[in-house]
Interface confidence: medium
Amino acid sequence: MLCLGWIFLWLVAGERIKGFNISGCSTKKLLWTYSTRSEEEFVLFCDLPEPQKSHFCHRNRLSPKQVPEHLPFMGSNDLSDVQWYQQPSNGDPLEDIRKSYPHIIQDKCTLHFLTPGVNNSGSYICRPKMIKSPYDVACCVKMILEVKPQTNASCEYSASHKQDLLLGSTGSISCPSLSCQSDAQSPAVTWYKNGKLLSVERSNRIVVDEVYDYHQGTYVCDYTQSDTVSSWTVRAVVQVRTIVGDTKLKPDILDPVEDTLEVELGKPLTISCKARFGFERVFNPVIKWYIKDSDLEWEVSVPEAKSIKSTLKDEIIERNIILEKVTQRDLRRKFVCFVQNSIGNTTQSVQLKEKRGVVLLYILLGTIGTLVAVLAASALLYRHWIEIVLLYRTYQSKDQTLGDKKDFDAFVSYAKWSSFPSEATSSLSEEHLALSLFPDVLENKYGYSLCLLERDVAPGGVYAEDIVSIIKRSRRGIFILSPNYVNGPSIFELQAAVNLALDDQTLKLILIKFCYFQEPESLPHLVKKALRVLPTVTWRGLKSVPPNSRFWAKMRYHMPVKNSQGFTWNQLRITSRIFQWKGLSRTETTGRSSQPKEW
């Protein structure tokens, strides 16, 4: 009965989500005045009401003494799982931002507008993605964004949307929309850094006592502008970069080092000039080749220069001179590489010299060439082995999952809560990888059936024996390793799986190195050994997100061979089993805990 009640609640909430009523959303008006002269970005934060952030959206329905039986939105402390919509002006249904607007990017609970323009004006709505209670449905924020180009050119020295801070010195960050006002007449400003409130900063200019590299980031400044009718939040975004001081040195040439070069007549030749330029805020490097022939001197038109390495302190730039074939005349010439910055210039000349003992060299080169070709072919085979295997499986292999009496292709284990600061603040959370990307790619695109405890079984936590049972019913175990994982209670799931895999040859384990972690001393010996021998796939942040990335290819390589044509029916079969499982869990277990019990 209790189970049916839960399913009913879930369905009701689900229905209300599809066409949810936005009249209950809190409203915020924002103004973005952009400069037509410069590129600038803009952000919207999902400022859900304060109680929502502590998972308590329906505060107006309860007195402080009343405690609801079911706390809403238990999903996430950092509000990383929010959904954004745009409300079309013609009254059409809400549009999911991700599907319709390529110039708008969602990162956790922030919406980034990459390009300015009046067409960005409109109403944007955000709300929690994970609806855990029907009360939550009304928990949303509507942001009315008005975008205008800057009209008055009265302020000539308005602060840029890209500002530099010199490392090791004092610096300041100015709010572009207020930089023409004196500190005295400036309104109270609210500042954010990388989406986090800087509660101390209240003026239109932040003075940085001493600049460190961690001062780099995206700063947002807000202030309120009121007229007789309403008040607007005027927002500007500043990209702050930490830099070193301008170089005091002229560039140095790293290559060529020698002033003579042995060549073969009649053969093509490329001479490379690599130069290192120190950092300059206004950077106008010059790198060119010219030829000296007796008294004559002329510049050669050569391919464009390209940057081959760029660091905070310097940049290495390369430019090549290409000779289609070396002639006798070229042996009498000097090839000069000339490099220059604002401090000065440096040159390096190269004289060509004919090579001796060419026949011997041909034999040697032939042998080396063959060897290199064999090695390259081997390397290519090794590099693309996964793709080859996947291609073979697609057309040749039979479905390994038939008749193995297993319900899931994979059980996915990850850290369900974070006690450690996130390693990946600028990228995606492990929870997002497990609950969103895995189903998107492995289930929807490749037809695998996954078991995610938070989604499929019991979001509040399950008994240890339940987890063991689920792992037994899975063909693979996928474990997302991170500091939170190895130091948290979820490590028990890996321990259990390792023990089971020793007895069950059909259960294979896959480790995902989500981010760097140190093995705690307390890890059981068996788990430590498993971390060294089990196949590991490394998560490379945003690079791994696209379904065609190498990450997903490796994942598919380790997953069971599956006949994807039949996946719709297979999913229906699995879904019905999960529902049976849910029913069992809900009725059999009473005191749920957020950790596995009795282990």
């Epitope: 986090k196 509660s199 101390v200 900063e201 001493e210 460190y212 600061p421």
Partner: antibody, heavy 121, light 111 residues
Framework: QEQLEESGGGLVKPGASLTFTCRAS?????????MCWVRQAPGKGLEWIAC????????TYYASWAKGRFTISKTSSTSVTLQMTSLTAADTATYFC?????????????WGPGTLVTVSS | DVVMTQTPASVSEPVGGTVSLKCQAS??????LNWYQQKPGQPPKLLIY???TLASGVSSRFKGSRSGTEYTLTISDLECADAATYYC?????????????FGGGTEVVVK
């Protein structure tokens, strides 16, 4: 060896003013530290008063309750002072001078032994 | 201003035991939280910074952790020398260093 030493404490009458000095040895302020004052009433907890950045900006930061009556300043490359006015019995406490690490971690890793002030008529 | 609330005010535990001290922040302060140990007649001593990083020279018996706005200092294998008052301190998330508030302290008595 890096050390801090406070001076200037003693017995004072209500309404009086007082200046504490914190002297650093084993390091100089050129590295860009924050020097701060924290007090502790007898048998009570710690209470942050103020900080000064001893690098170029000389920025000062005060606890909201300390603004106006307390003034922190750098007097040399190795000393910082805290001036207090209109003293009351509630200001009776041990006053500690503390230094932060000089990096992004934000914590006091060096403390002085403290100087006791008793405000009584 | 952020308010730091420490619980319990006092705790007593035998030698070799484990004690957990709690510190609750009135608002989100991320991991900007430090723990100090103070013995009578001495200045405080830094134990943990950034909510969970051990300061240099501090025993690994001290462990800091965080869950939302609640921070915990756990002392395992208690020794007589651990008898002291422990304070948590937060620093506001600003561009510059601004220490903000100390908790009221928890007295640890080792029996």
């Amino acid at each position: 060896q890096e050390q801090l030493e406070e001076s200037g404490g003693g017995l004072v009458k209500p309404g009086a003013s007082l200046t504490f000095t914190c002297r650093a040895s084993g390091f100089s302020f050129s590295s860009g530290y924050y020097m701060c004052w924290v007090r502790q009433a007898p048998g009570k907890g710690l209470e942050w008063i103020a900080c000064i950045y001893v690098g170029i900006t000389g920025s000062t930061y005060y606890a909201s309750w300390a603004k106006g009556r307390f003034t922190i300043s750098k007097t040399s490359s190795t000393s910082v002072t805290l001036q207090m006015t209109s003293l009351t019995a509630a200001d009776t406490a041990t006053y500690f001078c503390a230094r932060d690490t000089g990096n992004s971690n934000y914590q006091f890793n060096l403390w002085g032994p403290g100087t006791l002030v008793t405000v009584s008529s | 201003d952020v308010v730091m609330t420490q619980t319990p005010a006092s705790v007593s535990e035998p030698v070799g035991g484990t004690v957990s001290l709690k510190c609750q922040a009135s608002e989100s302060i991320d991991s900007y939280l430090n723990w100090y140990q103070q013995k009578p007649g001495q200045p405080p001593k830094l134990l943990i910074y950034g909510a969970s990083t051990l300061a240099s020279g501090v025993s690994s018996r001290f462990k800091g952790s965080r869950s939302g706005t609640e921070y915990t200092l756990t002392i395992s294998d208690l020794e007589c020398a651990d008898a002291a008052t422990y304070y948590c301190q937060c620093t506001v998330y600003g561009v510059n260093f601004v220490p903000n508030a100390f908790g009221g302290g928890t007295e640890v008595v080792v029996k």
